[in-house]
């Protein structure tokens, strides 16, 4: 129920990568506007994105306060130009989002290979420790800072002349792998949080190959 010229939001969806978190919904507004509220299970509601005609609201600033909390959002619909108007029950129409726990559900962003260095038959591959929007003591934390040992990286590596992908895993941001002398290798990494049951893997990093700028070769 509600006033005849407002419709409730629907398809409320969390879109979150490395804790950058946006709530999206439908429909595109016609003669109506939206306001979003967010709360933890035990907390008070906080209003965001007041009287907007957008169908998304960036809630990053709220969820990064405690990424291990579970959040609930709701989207209120108001008639455009008459935001005091309410539904027939005396309250504006609203729709609840699914619950969202950032630590468990944020998608892992595409990682980047920072560098690789060959020393003889060993190659050290370093993954960039990406900065997140989670803050502690006024500094932004890296993905490793937030997830600690819950975060691992899988390295795929292969000879340029071959298709089979060998793998290595690390719970740091560095790999040390054995390679055949005189062979060029390509590398790609994937972030993984094994303790999760969903959203466990990131997309693969761009492929980096030996003989390109990022690497360094030293003959020992």
């Amino acid at each position: 129920s509600g006033t005849t010229n407002t419709v409730a939001a629907y398809n409320l969806t969390w879109k979150s990568t490395n804790f950058k978190t946006i709530l999206e919904w439908e429909p595109k507004p016609v003669n109506q506007v939206y306001t979003v509220q967010i709360s933890t299970k035990s907390g008070d509601w906080k209003s965001k994105c007041f009287y907007t005609t957008d169908t998304e609201c960036d809630l990053t600033d709220e969820i990064v306060k405690d990424v291990k909390q579970t959040y609930l959002a709701r989207v209120f619909s108001y008639p455009a130009g008459n935001v005091e108007s309410t539904g027939s029950a005396g309250e504006p129409l609203y729709e609840n989002s699914p619950e969202f726990t950032p630590y468990l559900e944020t998608n892992l962003g595409q990682p980047t290979i920072q560098s690789f260095e060959q020393v003889g038959t060993k190659v050290n591959v370093t993954v960039e420790d990406e900065r997140t929007l989670v803050r502690r003591n006024n500094t932004f934390l890296s993905l490793r800072d937030v997830f600690g040992k819950d975060l691992i990286y899988t390295l795929y590596y292969w000879k340029s002349s071959s298709s089979g992908k060998k793998t290595a895993k690390t719970n740091t941001n560095e790999f040390l792998i054995d390679v055949d002398k005189g062979e060029n290798y390509c590398f790609s990494v994937q972030a993984v949080i094994p303790s999760r049951t969903v959203n466990r893997k990131s997309t693969d990093s761009p492929v980096e190959c030996m003989g390109q700028e990022k690497g360094e070769f030293r003959e020992i």
Partner: antibody
Framework: EVQLVESGGGLVQPGGSLRLSCAAS????????IHWVRQAPGKGLEWVGY????????YYADSVNGRFTISADTSKNTAYLQMNSLRAEDTAVYYC?????????????WGQGTLVTVSS | DIQMTQSPSSLSASVGDRVTITCRAS??????VAWYQQKPGKAPKLLIY???FLYSGVPSRFSGSRSGTDFTLTISSLQPEDFATYYC?????????FGQGTKVEIK
């Protein structure tokens, strides 16, 4: 409940082909890695190969490279082992197993196995 | 490829005995070693991961340890249901490799 069920085994002549299936339930295969491991009668375990269903990456043991192909259909939550140019020494029980994907844990769930016999 | 040399290949023991099985890796594999139990006609089951961690649901009489490239599976007090074949496996690098297996039989 996590479950892996292999099927498709049977008797095949040397030089023939066979496709094994590994149907997964209780988890999404693209979130993990799937390995195939075989065991010849009365022998130990031999790793065959793996697939990351998320990106299609694979790697094979030297003994099967070029003859066997692992693939996955994420819409069916199923992995496959296509075996071509089969030899008598490929006779074995074939298991698929889930790789937990962590730095610490390897193959945490296994299927019941399916027997492949290569004989004329 | 990394070789995992497992010993003994078989052993006879009685219920209540302490049983030790060892595996030696041909090169450093850090702690990336698992132990599996397999009974006839059945799939292997994970017992120990990361050299010394007991997998969920596995009885505490099973334990694992590491000393350099040597890995040990110990059953502190053998039970009737423990008669089986045990395999070590390294997953430090591709291809993962298994030990040859140790068959634990009733004396």
């Amino acid at each position: 409940e996590v479950q892996l069920v292999e099927s498709g085994g049977g008797l095949v002549q040397p030089g023939g082909s066979l496709r094994l299936s590994c149907a997964a339930s209780g988890f999404t295969i693209s979130d993990y890695w799937i390995h195939w491991v075989r065991q010849a009668p009365g022998k130990g375990l031999e790793w065959v190969g793996y697939i990351d269903p998320y990106n299609g990456y694979t790697y094979y043991a030297d003994s099967v490279n070029g003859r066997f192909t692992i693939s996955a259909d994420t819409s069916k939550n199923t992995a496959y082992l296509q075996m071509n140019s089969l030899r008598a020494e490929d006779t074995a029980v074939y298991y698929c197993a889930r790789d937990y994907g962590s730095y610490l844990v390897s193959l945490d769930y296994w299927g019941q196995g399916t027997l492949v016999t290569v004989s004329s | 490829d990394i070789q995992m040399t497992q010993s003994p290949s078989s052993l006879s023991a009685s219920v209540g005995d302490r049983v030790t099985i060892t595996c030696r890796a041909s090169q450093d594999v850090n702690t990336a070693v698992a132990w599996y139990q397999q009974k006839p006609g059945k799939a292997p089951k994970l017992l120990i991961y990361s050299a010394s961690f007991l997998y969920s649901g596995v009885p505490s009489r099973f334990s694992g340890s590491r000393s350099g490239t040597d890995f040990t599976l110990t059953i502190s007090s053998l039970q009737p249901e423990d008669f089986a074949t045990y395999y070590c496996q390294q997953h430090y690098t591709t291809p993962p490799t298994f030990g040859q297996g140790t068959k634990v039989e009733i004396k």
